[in-house]
């Protein structure tokens, strides 16, 4: 007689990351009997939803159901049918929806309502859609990377599971860059966190962590670009904006109404004598860098030290994982290697931005022009944010690790979010027999 394989005792979870520019669905899997152990949850699927972020559906909410269909059907295929009803589904919306809520709470509620109605029709255990705070986004990103790096494990290993693992229990800081916000989260060295809003206390696996976090709304790469354009058009003499952050020969027409649509440009809003203007690229890294620095107000700081805009930032400490758009942009620019110094990155950016647009289009024929055109700005913005915004130096640059995936799981807030909501991060170190689910973050 043939031996029948026992069904594997696994669990699944789904998290949708409803970002400002797009939505991604992540499917996680873990052994049911080991759910209190650290490092056992891993990503088995990522599905990128075709289309923009959910905040863009405010005038066409009837299309939300169709928008989510492909990825939800993919989840139906990947997860065994017998597990569907036990599989929790969470949707977290980030800064794009925070901005929409600032404009109109009613419109944000309408979008979330239709998202929830659509997701509730699937056979999973839908646990709701909500706008997560910037503080949560930072905290869950920090939990994700440290969980995946094995930093919460009390067992010291003789081998390294990831290239940048330093084999000690010092946690990594987390640097997250989205389209509409950016987060910085780390454990400062014996430093009091001077602003309570930026302080988090965790007890994870029997150890206490005092964590600093801040989310800069409007300082994601897309909103930062809108801010820069709104600032620069103020001083343009006519409807032509000669922009150093775009390649020489690049041209694009921008509607003033689009420019002022976001709350992020309100501070630069003025009555202009034209409805449209044309960006004309001149491709100059240094000038682009200078223009970006004007977005950071460093003249005011009510604390011992600040990042920018009067926000407290303790001295940087330890290694940092830089993920999401930090990684995607630097990966495109081929600048993620540990061996590339900050000076080298700056040199490469100078060369890249100076390349003519026609040449760039030929070299990267497979890349959508909308994205391709913005890599010069995005790369320069990343350097400006890390160096002038967060005060990394040429020396501390080597402590930044541009991370896409760790152990096959994407770096980002979604895994940490699910671990918390499914009570899989115990406050105390689990014994060999599982503890009751009573003491969690």
């Amino acid at each position: 007689t043939q031996n029948k394989a026992l069904p594997e005792n696994v669990k699944y979870g789904i998290v949708l990351d409803a970002g400002s520019s797009h939505t991604s669905l992540y499917i996680y899997k873990w052994p049911a009997e080991k759910e209190n152990d650290t490092g056992v949850v891993h990503q088995v699927e990522e599905c990128r939803v075709k289309g923009p972020g959910i905040s863009k559906f405010v005038q066409k909410v009837n299309e939300i159901g169709i928008y989510l269909t492909d990825c939800m059907e993919r989840a139906r295929e990947v997860i065994p049918r017998s597990q569907h009803q036990e599989t929790p589904v969470y949707l977290g919306a980030t800064a794009g929806m925070r901005l929409l809520r600032m404009e109109s709470e009613e419109l944000a509620d309408r979008v979330l309502d239709v998202v929830e109605r659509s997701l509730s029709n699937y056979p999973f255990d839908f646990q709701g859609a909500r706008i997560i705070t910037g503080q949560e986004e930072g905290a869950y990103g920090w939990i994700t990377i440290n969980y995946l790096l094995g930093k919460f494990s009390q067992k010291t290993r003789w081998f390294s599971i990831v290239p940048y693992e330093t084999n000690n229990q010092e946690t990594f800081g987390a640097l997250d860059l989205g389209g509409a916000s950016t987060q910085v989260t780390f454990v400062p060295q014996n430093q009091t966190i001077e602003s309570p809003d930026n302080a988090l206390q965790f007890r994870l696996y029997g150890k206490d962590y005092n964590v600093y976090t801040h989310s800069f709304l409007c300082y994601g790469k897309d909103q930062a670009l809108w801010q820069k354009l709104a600032k620069d058009i103020q001083v343009a003499s006519n409807e032509i904006l000669r922009d150093p952050c775009f390649h020489p020969g690049y041209k694009k027409v921008v509607n003033v109404s689009d420019l002022y649509k976001t709350p992020c440009t309100k501070r630069f809003e003025m009555t202009l004598p034209f409805q449209q203007f044309e960006i004309q690229g001149i491709g100059n890294y240094q000038q682009c860098h200078q223009s970006i620095l004007e977005l950071f107000n460093t003249s005011y700081c009510p604390y011992s030290q600040c990042a920018f805009n009067g926000i407290f930032l303790p001295p940087l400490q330890g290694d940092f994982g830089a993920f999401s758009a930090f990684y995607f942009v630097m990966k495109f620019l081929n600048l993620t290697s540990e061996k590339v110094s900050q000076e080298k990155v700056t040199e490469m950016m100078k060369k890249f931005c100076a390349q003519p647009w026609e040449e760039i289009k030929t070299s990267y024929a497979g890349v959508k022009e909308k994205y391709l055109s913005e890599y010069c700005f995005s790369g320069t913005y990343i350097l400006s944010l890390l160096l002038q915004g967060y005060h990394f130096t040429a020396d501390s640059w080597e402590h930044i690790h541009f991370i896409g995936k760790i152990q096959g799981s994407d770096a980002g807030w979604t895994l940490g979010y699910m671990l918390n909501l499914t009570n899989m991060i115990p406050a105390e170190q689990p014994l060999s027999t599982p503890l009751s689910h009573s003491t969690y973050v």
Epitope: V61, N62, D109, R110, E116, R117, S120, Q127
Partner: antibody, heavy 121, light 107 residues
Framework: QVQLVQSGAEVKKPGSSVKVSCKAS????????ISWVRQAPGQGLEWMGS????????NYAQKFQGRVTITADESTSTAYMELSSLRSEDTAVYYC??????????????WGRGTLVTVSS | EIVMTQSPATLSVSPGERATLSCRAS??????LAWYQQKPGQAPRLLIY???TRATGIPARFSGSGSGTEFTLTISSLQSEDFAVYYC?????????FGGGTKVEIK
């Protein structure tokens, strides 16, 4: 003053379908969601599904999925609930109810008078 | 789905007395809880939403409290028209779910 006016009582055979209507009179209809809630004799309330007429977005309780269809006609300010493959356990009063708002405001601030559906051979 | 449990199933109270009805959710619903009153042969009527906000036209003797998983509806001084069945409903997550009801009867 908005009112939800429901269609009259129905007697149906097992295996057949029933379609109950709910017309909003005296106010706006489209932008509010309409839910259908049923109550079997001497029992509690059971939510079946919901629709936002303006968006055409419907969602259903898993228990009824595949057997219930909720639609709306904006032009007549009417919502419909069709339940198929009827069985004796579907004998109940079927209410339409207006949801007060979006997202976390899904409580019912206005109810129809109910439609008794009897399933009997 | 979230299971709503009401207790007691029946509450016998004399007119003028206070009635306290309980509702428990199987998981947190924050403050997304509503209470309804239903009299025989009638549709339910909204009393309370958001756990503690009285609906339009509802007398002050009706009050709601609680958050998370434990909720209470209090009728401070029962009037003859208050003898009815009371239902709680969570409005946090789909599917929307109701408790089994508490019948408030004359003692």
């Amino acid at each position: 003053q908005v009112q939800l006016v429901q269609s009259g009582a129905e007697v149906k055979k097992p295996g057949s379908s029933v379609k109950v209507s709910c017309k909003a009179s005296g106010g706006t209809f489209s932008s509010y969601a309409i839910s259908w809630v049923r109550q079997a004799p001497g029992q509690g309330l059971e939510w079946m599904g919901s629709i936002i007429p303006i968006f055409g977005t419907a969602n259903y309780a898993q228990k009824f999925q595949g057997r219930v269809t909720i639609t709306a006609d904006e032009s007549t300010s009417t919502a419909y609930m069709e339940l198929s493959s009827l069985r004796s356990e579907d004998t109940a009063v079927y209410y339409c109810a207006r949801e007060a708002g979006y997202y976390r405001y899904r409580y019912f601030d206005l109810w129809g008078r109910g439609t008794l559906v009897t399933v009997s051979s | 789905e979230i299971v709503m449990t009401q207790s007691p199933a029946t509450l016998s109270v004399s007119p003028g007395e206070r009635a306290t009805l309980s509702c428990r959710a199987s998981q947190s619903v924050s403050s997304n809880l509503a209470w309804y009153q239903q009299k025989p042969g009638q549709a339910p009527r909204l009393l309370i939403y958001g756990a503690s906000t009285r609906a339009t036209g509802i007398p002050a003797r009706f009050s709601g409290s609680g958050s998370g998983t434990e909720f209470t509806l209090t009728i401070s001084s029962l009037q003859s028209e208050d003898f009815a069945v009371y239902y709680c409903q969570q409005h946090a997550l789909w599917p929307l779910t109701f408790g089994g009801g508490t019948k408030v009867e004359i003692k």
